[in-house]
């Protein structure tokens, strides 16, 4: 069958019909419905929401909607033994205690089951000691402390401000520095934008607000007790001592009112420079310990959270493809929230819900997509991407053979300034073409395309007249699909103006104040940005599932490979003497990139010319496109990170949220001047160049004529 036989309307009209069916008012209604009570992973409330979504997706017209459950390791505070931090005097008396929970937002005073702020998977413990302020607890912050300032964190409790990097990396860095506890806090410099009121009168963080979040270092493993395999009924589970990624020291988050009380007494060294100062009225002294009058006082943590194997539920909906039912385009986003989830995740879940409804409406009118579309409502994303990862582990053989693309659908908004897209280079042209067809929702861009407003507000640093598209990192449910399985992936949301708002994420992220009202009053009263994100995500899924030739352009991969090769070469060339001494050459990598470029160019020419009415040739060409991303997977994975297998991209070893290019080479070069055995270190650089060059060459060959 050709594509047109799969449908009773023309391809162009299909897309228009799908997009026209998406309604802002529905997204608003769905968001309200999803945010009235907490939906914490592993709770009855979240199970009930899973069943509600299953029922509604069936009503919307999907062919089947199933729940997929797993029993995974989760973490909860002890209800009768709360977590808190104290300042204690020399007699051990608690003279100050941090808040046990956040003041409730107006209208939610009587809501039960609001989980108090905690760092998920923190071990239990009651360490006490002197405090050291470690800025953002980044790798470079600890370098500054240990190497330049000669401050030893061993046996100390460190206090770090949230922002810049994933909190799990902060905890890992603190552990490596020998700390015995970590206090995480939100500084107004990062979570309070000037000129904006705090909630409930604006979108800024109040002093009692606290960011929850997991502090794992899973590196893509999924459930800590069943790495590599699904946490099903017959799973073999590791003992807790062998679990993947668990922190070894107690960790707890606080708001800036409480942080003020800890930081105002700090003594010891002054901050090394202004980049270590936040916006509180405190000196930001590094420590260790409190100043003169308070020098006998210590900080004590009281952490009593427990890790528990708990059942979670994904909702998996299927809309069977009419022509290629064995090719899967997946749209997935999580359902579990820390509290109400006004932005994270329900602004995304509401958009997915409306996309499903629109596809269902078309299906009821007799239309089907060319390829199968799978819709997923993932559970336990907040606890380490667990629902998506377990499902992908269970279905890995199907996915690696049939997975065309994965589009992520977490928070639809983190601001209301412009579009933000992170995706594989294969999707650049798809995103460009789609956004040229969509109307911009931005003020001042009436009648203009989304592409135009996006390009104006977020220009590409390399190509004039084009918008910025970023690398995929991690910290969301695309991770297993892209980094482990090599399925082309992308994500889109509306974001803030990064130039004028240099805070990290959005201020109320993972706090109790992430409510429906936050979105409806302050971010998107008309839900026009949500609608635009629905059009982008839905439009991408539509094109990926329905276009006769997959909308992937392999030439864009060639362009970025050259850019990444240049970049990693420049990093290496900071050590010209060592490169000479150890005969380090990038020739093989540049040669492979050149070959890839030439082969991709020839493939693209053939793609224009081949007979699209020949289903065998069409399928062959599409398979070459589908499997190109897969060709960048190294089955052995990256060093010490077996589930990060993509050779071109991986989450940064220093910040899970950020993507790093040629991560194997990058990590081998990182801080190489401090390695005790330079010969071994440079040998590893050479090995990583070899792996990268081989992988790029091998990927290129998958695009060559098959015979």
């Amino acid at each position: 069958k050709s594509s047109n036989e799969a449908t009773n309307i023309t391809p162009k009209h299909n897309m228009k019909a799908f997009l026209d069916e998406l309604k802002a008012e529905n997204i608003k209604k769905f968001l309200y419905n999803f945010t009235q009570i907490p939906h914490l992973a592993g709770t009855e409330q979240n199970f009930q929401l899973a069943k509600q979504i299953q029922s509604q997706w069936k009503e919307f017209g999907l062919d089947s909607v199933e729940l997929a459950h797993y029993d995974v390791l989760l973490s909860y505070p002890n209800k009768t033994h709360p977590n808190y931090i104290s300042i204690i005097n020399e007699d051990g008396n608690e003279i100050f205690n941090t808040s046990l929970f956040e003041p409730p937002p107006p209208g939610y005073e009587n809501v039960s089951d609001i989980v108090p702020p905690f760092s998920a998977f923190s071990p239990q413990g009651m360490p006490e000691g002197d405090l050291v302020y470690v800025n953002y607890a980044r790798t470079e912050d600890f370098f500054k402390l240990e190497r330049d300032m000669k401050i030893n964190c061993s046996g100390k409790i460190v206090i770090a401000r949230y922002g810049k990097v994933f909190r799990g990396n902060k905890v890992k860095n603190a552990q490596l520095a020998g700390a015995k506890g970590v206090i995480l806090y939100s500084d107004p410099a990062d979570y309070f934008a000037p000129g904006v009121k705090s909630y409930p009168d604006g979108w800024n963080l109040p002093g009692g607000g606290v960011q929850r979040g997991n502090i794992l270092n899973l590196n893509g493993a999924g459930d800590p007790l069943t790495p590599g395999y699904p946490a099903n009924e017959y799973a073999y589970r590791r003992g807790i001592a062998e679990a993947v990624g668990l922190p070894s020291i107690p960790v707890h988050p606080i708001g800036y009112y409480d942080a003020q009380k800890l930081l105002e007494k700090m003594g010891g060294s002054a901050p090394p420079d202004s980049s270590w100062r936040g916006s509180l009225k405190v000196p930001y002294n590094v420590g260790p310990g409190f100043t003169g009058n308070f020098s006998t006082q210590k900080v004590k943590m009281h952490i009593h959270s427990t890790n528990e194997v708990t059942r979670i539920y994904n909702v998996i909906g299927t809309l069977r493809g009419a022509v290629e039912p064995d090719r899967y385009v997946i749209l997935g986003g999580h359902r579990d929230s820390w509290v109400f989830g006004g932005i994270d995740p329900q602004s995304g879940a509401a958009v997915v819900h409306e996309i499903v409804r629109s596809f269902g409406t078309l299906k009821k009118e007799g239309w089907r997509p060319r390829r199968t579309i799978l819709f997923a409502s993932w559970d336990a994303e907040e606890f380490g991407l667990l629902g998506s990862t377990e499902w992908a582990e269970e279905n890995s053989r199907l996915l690696q053979e049939r997975g065309v693309a994965y589009i992520n659908a977490d928070s639809s908004i983190e601001g209301n300034y412009t579009l933000r897209v992170d995706c594989t280079p294969l999707m650049y042209s798809l995103v460009h073409n789609l956004t040229k067809e969509l109307k911009s929702p931005d003020e001042g861009f009436e009648g203009k395309s989304l592409y135009e407003s996006w390009t104006k507000k977020s220009p590409s640093p390399e190509f004039s007249g084009m918008p910025r598209i970023s690398k995929l990192g991690s910290g969301n449910d695309f991770e297993v699909f892209f980094q482990r399985l090599g399925i082309a992936s992308g994500r889109a949301r509306y974001t803030k103006n990064w130039e004028t708002n240099k805070f990290s994420g959005y201020p109320l992220y993972h706090s109790v104040y992430e409510t429906y009202e936050l979105v409806e009053k302050f971010y998107d009263p008309m839900f026009k940005y949500h609608l635009t994100v629905a059009q982008v995500r839905g439009g991408m899924v539509f094109e990926l599932a329905n276009s006769i030739v997959l909308p992937f352009d392999c030439r864009d991969y060639a362009v970025v490979l050259r850019k990444y090769a240049d970049k990693i070469y420049s990093i290496s060339m900071k050590h010209p003497q060592e490169m000479k001494t150890y005969s380090v050459s990038f020739d093989s990598l540049f040669s492979a990139v050149k070959n890839f470029t030439e082969i991709a160019s020839k493939f693209s020419e053939r793609l224009q010319d081949f007979d699209k009415s020949n289903p065998i040739v069409l399928r062959m060409m599409n398979d070459q496109l589908m499997f190109l991303e897969r060709a960048f997977i190294d089955p052995l994975g990256l060093p010490d990170r077996p589930f990060y297998r993509h050779v071109i991209y991986a989450p940064s070893s220093h910040n899970k949220y950020a993507g790093e290019s040629f991560p194997g080479i990058y990590d081998a070069l990182f801080d190489i001047e401090s390695k005790v055995d330079p010969s071994k270190a440079w040998g590893e650089v050479k090995r990583q160049i070899y792996v990268a060059a081989f992988t790029v060459q091998a990927a290129a060959e998958t695009l060559s004529e098959v015979a």
């Epitope: 808040s99 046990l100 929970f101 003041p103 409730p104 107006p106 005073e109 009121k197 705090s198 409930p200 009168d201 109040p206 002093g207 009692g208 009053k521």
Partner: antibody
């Protein structure tokens, strides 16, 4: 000097209406949440209602929500309380008070205006 | 709603005495508590906020302490002008309720 001056109190029959006003001076009115707090004769203090900086959000004691309406006019530095269907138990001195946020104490108080509901 | 219970409801003391008034919240309010002083026929005046911070112009003989559910207002050496009624109030959530008051009278 901060000043809050209430007016509009007086004697009113049960079922009647009254509109209280509070004139503010000596501080930036729009930077403050404003509230009405009442005190029945010989009794303690009872919060009645609050309004946010620009008047877009209002909060009421549940039992009064259907009868009382708080409002403000920042251009006139004025706070109001419209009281309808008044009852004998609404008899009290009504104070206008200012706080610098939703989660904040009442830093400024007016001298109060007496409302007497009686037939 | 969070209820605030003050004790005692009244007390008699002499000038120079140390006076302690307690306030108990029905739920944990951390340090979101204020104390006010009210003299007959006058409006309340803020004494203490955030459980322990003295408001501007308040004499240092006044002090507040406590956290969570139990709070104390202490007058270290009672002065003639301190004879008044004292109220605690939480501002943790809506409605922000007041304690019943403690009347400090001359012995």
């Amino acid at each position: 000097e901060v000043q809050l001056v209430e007016s509009g109190g007086g004697l009113v029959q049960p079922g009647g209406s009254l509109r209280l006003s509070c004139a503010a001076s000596g501080f930036t009115f729009s930077d403050y949440y404003m509230a009405w707090v009442r005190q029945a004769p010989g009794k303690g203090l009872e919060w009645v209602a609050s309004i946010n900086y620009d008047g877009s959000s209002t909060y009421y004691l549940d039992s009064l929500k259907s009868r009382f309406t708080i409002s403000r006019d920042n251009a006139k530095n004025s706070l109001y309380l419209q009281m309808n269907s008044l009852r004998a138990e609404d008899t009290a001195v009504y104070y206008c008070a200012g706080s610098d946020g939703y989660w904040a104490w009442f830093a400024y108080w007016g001298q109060g205006t007496l409302v007497t509901v009686s037939s | 709603d969070i209820q605030m219970t003050q004790s005692p409801s009244s007390l008699s003391a002499s000038v120079g005495d140390r006076v302690t008034i307690t306030c108990r919240a029905s739920g944990n309010i951390h340090n979101y508590l204020a104390w006010y002083q009210q003299k007959p026929g006058k409006a309340p005046q803020l004494l203490v906020y955030n459980a322990e911070t003295l408001a501007d112009g308040v004499p240092s003989r006044f002090s507040g302490s406590g956290s969570g559910t139990d709070f104390t207002l202490t007058i270290s050496s009672l002065q003639p002008e301190d004879f008044a009624t004292y109220y605690c109030q939480h501002f943790w959530s809506t409605p922000p309720t007041f304690g019943g008051g403690t009347k400090v009278e001359i012995k």
